[in-house]
């Protein structure tokens, strides 16, 4: 009996036309939502004038439906048993699941000022930038709508720069009508233990953002894993959002709509400094902000963001070192709300429920030449927003799963 079940599972999790896995893989049957909480800065003037701690108050959730578009350019390669695809991006605002509208205003760090002052280091350029920041009446902080902040706006200061710089900025700009990939993943036809594992991303086996093993593209995209998952496994996956591969470890057994699943979580060790976790040495890319690689819980992804000083962390700086959160008041990290988990049905390897949580931060540094940053006496890794992307198998699909998979085994 068990052998027959194994044979059926192996057949049905292959990523090719006609299998259960393929149908759900091309277009997810699960509704996926991305909730945003924006960190509204309460004391912009005191920070700019006196280098005070930044007082933030989170506002949210603002919810979007995401990942509703089918994979595009799905192409099987029979020679190397892979399937390649693009994952299109799309976001639809859900007013009924949000505390306000996309037109709500927030006081946030001026993205353009922080990024430009960091990237454009030439003395004369900094003088030009300073005069244009003043001319455009820009400052260290700005008021922006949710829509502008997330999806992009034309920046008044960058628009005055007499060079062909990018004048539209936004945390997720550009997003709609773009796609992630090309991904090329193993379809499992020749070897089911490789199904959904990424072979190449954007035509390469490495990212070119990190040194050594940190640069590798490991595992799947976390939507599914090879079947017959064991609790002892370390599940590797790649997340383009954070420009790196990461891993999850077993935490507990969970019953999801009558389906026994394994809850895998991202452990604090994955965010540790190289002092505590030597494997993380290659995620430390500079010595100053990281205090000689002793800070932890924030990841400098500037190399993946055209040099813009973007730092990824867990929400509210969960699992981060005290020096990171010290200049920020109003954060309350807790594991239950702010960690990432995957609920995996172990027989098929399908992720039936997940919560991906991350925070987007921007580095801002004192600058002698730029007036609005002149009074700063320290570097700040400024939280802009955090997000919670969730998906849960629907009741109908859960019934089907129970009757066709778990029911047959029990």
């Amino acid at each position: 009996g068990d052998l027959l079940i194994q044979k059926t599972i192996k057949k049905q999790v292959v990523l090719e036309e006609g299998t259960i896995a393929f149908k759900n893989w091309v277009k997810t049957g699960t509704e996926v939502y991305r909730q945003f909480w924006i960190f509204d800065v309460q004391n912009p003037q005191e920070v700019m004038m006196n280098s005070s701690n930044i007082q933030v108050k989170q506002r949210g959730p603002y919810t979007y439906r995401v990942r509703f578009l089918a994979k595009e350019n799905v192409t099987q390669d029979a020679e190397d048993n892979t399937v390649s695809f693009l994952q299109p991006n799309g976001a639809i605002f859900e007013p009924s699941l949000s505390v306000g509208t996309e037109a709500d205003n927030f006081t946030v760090l001026n993205l353009a000022v922080a990024a430009a002052s960091h990237i454009y280091q030439n003395q004369f350029v900094q003088m030009i930038l300073n005069s244009l920041i003043n001319k455009s009446k820009s400052s260290m902080f700005q008021v922006r709508t949710l829509r502008e902040l997330l999806w992009g706006y034309r920046d008044p200061f960058l628009s005055l720069v007499p060079y062909p710089v990018t004048t539209t900025v936004g945390l997720f700009y550009p997003y709609n009508n773009t796609a992630d990939g090309v991904y090329k993943v193993f379809n499992g036809k020749d070897n089911i233990s490789k199904v959904a594992i990424i072979d190449t991303y954007k035509g390469k086996r490495n990212l070119s953002y990190w040194e050594s093993h940190c640069d590798m593209i490991n595992g799947t995209d976390a939507a599914s894993f090879p079947p017959f998952v064991e609790k002892s496994q370390v599940l590797q996956f790649f997340s383009s959002d954070i420009c790196r591969s990461i891993y999850a470890v077993f935490e507990s057994d969970v019953n999801l709509k009558g389906i026994p699943v394994y809850r895998f979580v991202l452990p604090s060790k994955a965010f540790a400094s190289p002092v505590e976790n030597p494997d993380n040495y290659c995620f430390c890319t500079e010595k100053i902000i990281s205090k000689n690689c002793t800070s932890y819980g924030v990841l400098d992804i500037s190399k993946c963001k055209e040099g813009r000083p973007v730092y990824i962390s867990l929400p509210h700086f969960l699992y981060a070192s005290p020096d990171v959160s010290e200049p920020i008041d109003g954060l309350n990290p807790n594991e239950e709300e702010h960690r990432t988990y995957l609920d995996i049905e172990p027989i098929t390897g399908f992720t039936l429920q997940f919560a991906k949580r991350l925070q987007v931060n921007l580095l801002v540094k004192p600058s002698e030449k730029i007036q609005v940053l002149k009074n700063l006496k320290r570097n700040y890794i400024v939280p802009i927003l955090w997000l919670n992307e969730t998906g849960t198998i629907g009741d109908e699909k859960a019934n089907m799963f129970r009757s066709q998979v778990t029911g047959k085994i029990n």
């Epitope: 990024a115 990237i119 030439n122 004369f124 007499p162 060079y163 710089v165 055209e306």
Partner: nanobody
Framework: QVQLQESGGGLVQPGGSLRLSCAAS????????MSWYRQTPGKERELVAA????????YYADSVKGRFTISRDDAKNTVYLQMNSLKPEDTAVYYC?????????????WGQGTQVTVSS
């Protein structure tokens, strides 16, 4: 490849004049802001004069205002620094710099420098 070659430095008496030239190649000269910096031993490089582009913003350090003039000839891919009423404190290595911005990148190039010595 990008090259910036300074010339025109030398020994001059206080009150004298010199004209520095910087010949550029390997990039679209007219798209770049051109600057002159100077450095004395143990000190940081100091911005002396800069010019955004022909007809664009020019900048002079307070210490050289009224004495130094920056100019450029886009047809010859050359930037000049006319230095009049030279003082002993103008003694330094003078460097030519070319910079432009594109997207989120800064392209910043330097010459090897030319020595200017003001002494009697």
């Amino acid at each position: 490849q990008v090259q910036l070659q300074e010339s025109g430095g030398g020994l001059v008496q206080p009150g004298g004049s010199l004209r520095l030239s910087c010949a550029a190649s390997g990039f679209t000269f007219s798209n770049y802001a051109m600057s002159w910096y100077r450095q004395t031993p143990g000190k940081e490089r100091e911005l002396v004069a800069a010019m955004q582009s022909t007809g664009g913003t020019t900048y002079y350090a307070d210490s050289v205002k009224g004495r130094f003039t920056i100019s450029r000839d886009d047809a010859k891919n050359t930037v000049y620094l006319q230095m009049n009423s030279l003082k002993p404190e103008d003694t330094a290595v003078y460097y030519c710099n070319a910079v432009t911005l594109q997207g989120w990148s800064e392209y910043d190039y330097w010459g090897q420098g030319t020595q200017v010595t003001v002494s009697s």
